[in-house]
């Protein structure tokens, strides 16, 4: 039994890091493998993650961590029974993938303006809370070409757009994702999408 692709991990910079790797053949990850992880700090415990399958030879483990700080470094040991297959380390602050924003809502009751709001996925005491920027994706269910991205570079988790920038009388969907420039993070996963029917009064033409 050998590791084909070494574990790579990303942290949500809050409480969970996710590690994925591939073995050299079909593996029952949960019965055959264990990933031990330990904060490099005096008197910290070595926790054990039981991996789950992620495709035939792929495994995934969710590491549960304290509130992360930038100096944190973890040792990782991948075991098959008493055989050490791989040894490495992981610094969560250098591999951050933010949590996905939640509670995306489209408010259509503001005259001729669409207000999209969502929730910051971090509590106020987390460093990323004040460092997230967002991308909002809006697309038409009827027309695949009608697909747009709005970059939200301010801190407020909201976006206002004129309803008239979208076609009237058809359904749209929106989703939002986040990233943090300060840690050069990857983008989060997209939030669940929300759907609304776009309708607004066309202005009377002046003759």
């Amino acid at each position: 039994m050998k590791v084909l692709q070494e574990p790579t991990c990303v942290s949500d910079y809050m409480s969970i890091s996710t590690c994925e790797w591939k073995m050299n053949g079909p593996t029952n990850c949960s019965t055959e493998l264990r990933l031990l992880y330990q904060l490099v700090f005096l008197l910290s415990e070595a926790h054990t993650c039981i991996p789950e399958n992620n495709g035939g030879a792929g495994c995934v483990c969710h590491l549960l961590m304290d509130d992360v700080v930038s100096a944190d470094n973890y040792t990782l040991d991948l075991w098959a029974g008493q055989q050490l297959l791989w040894k490495g380390s992981f610094k969560p602050s250098e591999h951050v993938k933010p949590r996905a924003p939640g509670n995306l809502t489209v408010h259509t009751n503001v005259s001729d303006t669409l207000l999209l709001t969502w929730s910051n996925p971090y509590p106020p005491d987390n460093y990323l809370y004040n460092h997230l920027t967002y991308a909002v994706n809006i697309w038409s269910e009827n027309d695949p070409a009608d697909f747009r991205i709005y970059n939200v570079t301010y801190l407020e988790p909201s976006l206002r757009i004129a309803a008239s920038t979208l076609k009237s009388g058809i359904s749209y969907r929106a989703r939002v994702r986040a990233w943090a420039q300060c840690y050069n993070t990857t983008w989060s996963e997209w939030s669940p999408s929300t759907k609304w029917h776009n309708s607004y009064r066309e202005p009377f033409e002046q003759h």
């Epitope: 969970i16 949960s30 008197l43 415990e45 926790h47 993650c49 549960l64």
Partner: antibody, heavy 129, light 108 residues
Framework: EVQLVESGGGLVQPGGSLRLSCAAS?????????MCWVRQAPGKCLEWIGC?????????YYASWAKGRFTISRDNSKNTVYLQMNSLRAEDTAVYYC????????????????????WGQGTLVTVSS | DIQMTQSPSSLSASVGDRVTITCQAS??????LAWYQQKPGKAPKLLIY???TLAYGVPSRFSGSGSGTDFTLTISSLQPEDFATYYC???????????FGCGTKVTV
């Protein structure tokens, strides 16, 4: 300095109740590990009572013999874990230790306490009339 | 619940001796076994976890081995400060129990 300090032990009558406290210092009792209680009757074996997960989920596990009479809780604002003991009997006389434990996890919701790494000094509970 | 059978319950040894203590689990507990040292009036001290990993600050004369149901703690050369009681701790998440062995008292 990282340490655990138990308090609340003493003499209690059979059938009575007692609440023990375990104050954590040098680390956060709300971080990713279990806080557990272990006891040792005079001249007897060590006996695991139960654990509470210190992270956001706060899940608890108990030894089969402890379910019902013993309850573990926590107050993160005070960095303290408690053991509530009810319907006490003479055989509950023991030194009660608080301990921090590592865990085994599968996914993010299934987390099992494993070995006890850091121990308090213990507090003596005597159940007698 | 699992049962942890520790043997011997006591042993006499001299400084410099090689000492072996065994612990047997009533079911397969993989490598979820730890060893502790306890001195009178003191809390237990972790020596070894995951059957064979030495805890921080523990002298290298202590070693652990085994997996599944049979485990061993070895002290390669007994020192004066090693006279104490030793306990194993087996953890079984399948049965939901953490069970200690009943100890081995090492005396002069």
């Amino acid at each position: 300095e990282v340490q655990l300090v138990e308090s609340g032990g003493g003499l209690v009558q059979p059938g009575g109740s007692l609440r023990l406290s375990c104050a954590a210092s040098g680390f956060s009792s709300s971080s990713a590990h279990y806080m557990c209680w272990v006891r040792q009757a005079p001249g007897k074996c060590l006996e695991w009572i139960g654990c509470i997960y210190a992270g956001s989920r706060g899940s608890t596990y108990y030894a089969s013999w402890a379910k019902g009479r013993f309850t573990i809780s926590r107050d993160n604002s005070k960095n303290t874990v408690y053991l509530q003991m009810n319907s006490l009997r003479a055989e509950d006389t023991a030194v009660y230790y608080c301990a921090r434990a590592a865990f085994v996890n599968r996914g993010v919701s299934w987390i099992w306490p494993y070995y006890f790494s850091l121990w308090g000094q213990g507090t003596l509970v005597t159940v007698s009339s | 619940d699992i049962q942890m059978t520790q043997s011997p319950s006591s042993l006499s040894a001299s400084v410099g001796d090689r000492v072996t203590i065994t612990c047997q689990a009533s079911e397969d507990i993989e490598s979820y076994l730890a060893w502790y040292q306890q001195k009178p009036g003191k809390a237990p001290k972790l020596l070894i976890y995951r059957a064979s990993t030495l805890a921080y600050g523990v002298p290298s004369r202590f070693s652990g081995s085994g997996s599944g149901t049979d485990f061993t703690l070895t002290i390669s050369s007994l020192q004066p400060e090693d006279f104490a009681t030793y306990y194993c701790l087996g953890s079984s998440y399948s049965t939901g129990s953490n069970i200690f062995g009943c100890g081995t008292k090492v005396t002069v």
